[in-house]
């Protein structure tokens, strides 16, 4: 999947398997990813679990778990608030699309959670305070967490320079992964730009991203997860400034 | 091994009035450099380990970003703390606890918020 | 919980071979350089060698340089120990253990070379 | 290499009474950015060892305060304050500063 991290930085992640997203004292939010297709390096997000720890007066320990094709509006004991302490309320799960759109609210740490379901595969967004970001009693155990410190290099697609090759070539190879041998030859480079342009008019890495998706999938349920994404962070980003983030001239090889 | 705590101080560091990417301020090359001297100071116990070269390519990634040179002044951290997780013994019958927003304008201006998102393939 | 699991000691002919693994448990072990250290019977800890979180490098003390290898597959969450030319100074209880230098230690496992 | 020489060897304590092993460094155990990088480990009898002090001084989770770790260069000191029944053991100390890494021979603490 793509990940933005708590620093903007933007990478493309072939993470395989349970990754922990977020881990600190108050939260824990783990995500497990597939391959999209079978031989293809690229994976996206199959389930997502969410960890709200015990805290104090406000909230009981919750656990949210979403899959393809179940994205409930209630934690897995079936509640929607924080249990049955005095500030309860300060934890609450809200179904805005069903089946498709859930919102968490955890006014008590000042985080919001935003959980789609996009075509087959799950989205994430979170809003969360850097003091709460950096709640960390165990860094060695705690503090290696994707959001924080982004996905690690043998794990990074160089998808800018496989957009660029594309761009030139036409070529629908993925750069640092192996082929995806079953993804529909009949999706060119140029619908791909057509199909992306129209929901992303911004030629930013979110774009870039979608038309990556398309190319390596030929699915095009990948343009709506870019543009659901940007608007997350459109709702979610304290820094209006930071919302596109753009191809970097001077960069790290295998860094987006 | 220690390098989280230099990403933990470094976050303090640059915990001012906007986020720390936007922030292209002699102030944040020098908690970059910090951020860079403290990461060499574990490299021994460290050096095997992802959190480490994560921060060395990240440090190079925000010096070449923020034009800061390598050479310059270095900064002290700001700490802040937040209330424990967990059950804490002081307990409070007021729900102002229970809203982050709140209990933070006691102690400070409005939070620094950061954003993290998963999507595609 | 972190938890260190070694395998694959026993008796071995001076100039055999065999193979340990240290399956890994509890934390992500894709993140951690990992080290070997052996215990003779009897005797006080030598450390064996290191390897990094992603195999980029491995480090080695002279007594075993060119016959032993480590190395790791995080897909699996398991550490390995090939050991070759088996001296009967090599007769130790080999212990894995995670970090770059050792925190969390396994409950070890005996190598004896004798003939 | 580096040489980790511990005193004493053996160390027989009384119960409640505090304990203090030695370990001398063969060369400067800090490098070049002022990072110093030695460790204690104890190993109870029919055990693993286990982290105590980790950089000099700082105490690993969950290893009870009455164990302190100090010194700098060459010299350093594993404190026990109020030696208790499970502290029975071998204590070793380890230097990270250098390749190849290395222990020191070990203190056997027993309890008088």
């Known amino acids: 999947p793509h990940l933005r991290t708590f620093t903007d930085r933007f990478q493309t992640c072939k993470v395989q398997g349970a990754w922990p997203l977020i881990d600190n004292n108050y939260l824990n939010v783990q995500v497990t990813n597939t391959p999209v297709l079978p031989g293809s390096a690229a994976t996206a997000t199959s389930k997502l679990t969410i960890i709200f720890k015990n805290f104090q007066e406000c909230v009981d320990q919750k656990v949210y778990q979403a899959e393809m094709d179940e994205l409930p509006a209630a934690f897995v004991d079936g509640s929607k608030n924080g249990g049955d302490k005095h500030g309860a309320n300060s934890l609450k799960i809200t179904e805005k699309v069903s089946g498709q759109h859930v919102e968490i609210q955890a006014k008590y740490i000042g985080t919001t959670i935003v959980v789609r379901q996009v075509g087959r595969y799950l989205t994430f967004a979170v809003r969360m305070p850097e003091e709460v970001v950096n709640a960390v009693e165990d860094w060695d155990s705690q503090g290696l967490y994707l959001c924080l410190r982004g996905c690690p290099l043998n794990q990074q697609i160089d998808f800018q320079a496989f957009h660029t090759n594309a761009e030139g070539t036409g070529a629908r190879r993925l750069a640092a992964a192996s082929p995806a041998p079953t993804a529909p030859e009949t999706f060119p480079y140029e619908t791909a730009v057509a199909k992306c342009k129209e929901k992303l008019p911004v030629e930013d890495l979110y774009y870039q991203a979608c038309v990556f998706d398309l190319l390596t999938t030929g699915d095009v349920n990948f343009t709506l997860a870019a543009y659901y994404a940007l608007e997350d962070v459109k709702m979610l980003h304290s820094n209006k400034d930071k919302l596109h983030l753009y191809e970097r001239t001077r960069d790290l090889p295998g860094r987006a | 091994c220690k390098i989280l705590k230099c990403n933990s101080e470094f976050w303090s560091a640059t915990s001012g009035s906007h986020a720390p990417a936007s922030d292209d301020t002699p102030e944040f090359c020098a908690a970059l450099r910090s951020y860079a001297l403290c990461t060499r100071r574990t490299a021994r116990t460290c050096r095997g380990d992802l959190a480490y070269h994560s921060a060395v390519h990240g440090i190079e990634d925000l010096m070449s970003q923020h034009n800061c040179s390598k050479d310059g002044p270095t900064s002290q951290p700001r700490l802040r703390t937040l209330p424990p997780a967990g059950d804490s013994q002081e307990r409070s019958d007021s729900p102002e606890i229970c809203h982050y927003e709140k209990s933070f304008h006691k102690h400070s201006a409005t939070p620094n918020y950061t954003h993290c998102g998963l999507f595609g393939d | 919980e972190v938890q260190l699991v070694e395998s694959g000691g026993g008796l071995v002919q001076p100039g055999g071979s065999l193979r340990l693994s240290c399956a890994a448990s509890g934390f992500t072990f894709s993140y951690y350089g990992m080290n070997w250290i052996r215990q003779a019977p009897g005797k006080g800890l030598e450390w064996i060698g290191m390897?990094?979180?992603?195999?980029?490098?491995?480090h080695y003390a002279d007594s075993v340089k060119g016959r032993f290898t480590i190395s790791r597959d995080n897909s699996k969450n398991t550490l390995y120990l090939q050991m070759n030319s088996l001296r009967a100074e090599d007769t130790a209880v080999y212990y894995c253990?995670?970090?770059?230098?050792?925190?969390?230690w396994g409950q070890g496992t005996m190598v004896t070379v004798s003939s | 290499d580096v040489v980790l020489t511990q005193s004493p060897l053996s160390l027989p304590v009384t119960l409640g009474q505090p304990a203090s092993i030695s370990c001398r460094s063969s060369?400067?155990?800090?490098?070049?950015?002022?990072?110093?990088?030695l460790e204690w480990f104890q190993q109870r009898p029919g055990q693993s060892p286990r982290l105590l002090i980790y950089?000099?001084?700082s105490r690993f989770s969950g290893v009870p305060d009455r164990f302190s770790g100090s010194g700098s260069g060459t010299d350093f000191t594993l404190k026990i304050s109020r030696v208790e029944a499970e502290d029975v053991g071998v204590y070793y100390c380890?230097?990270?500063?250098?390749?190849?890494?290395?222990f020191g021979q070990g203190t056997k603490l027993e309890i008088k």
């Open positions: 950089d000099v001084s």
């Open positions: 253990a995670k970090g770059t230098t050792p925190d969390y």
């Open positions: 390897i990094y979180y992603d195999s980029s490098e491995k």
């Open positions: 060369q400067s155990l800090e490098d070049s950015d002022g990072g110093t990088f």
């Open positions: 380890f230097q990270a500063t250098h390749d190849p890494l290395t």
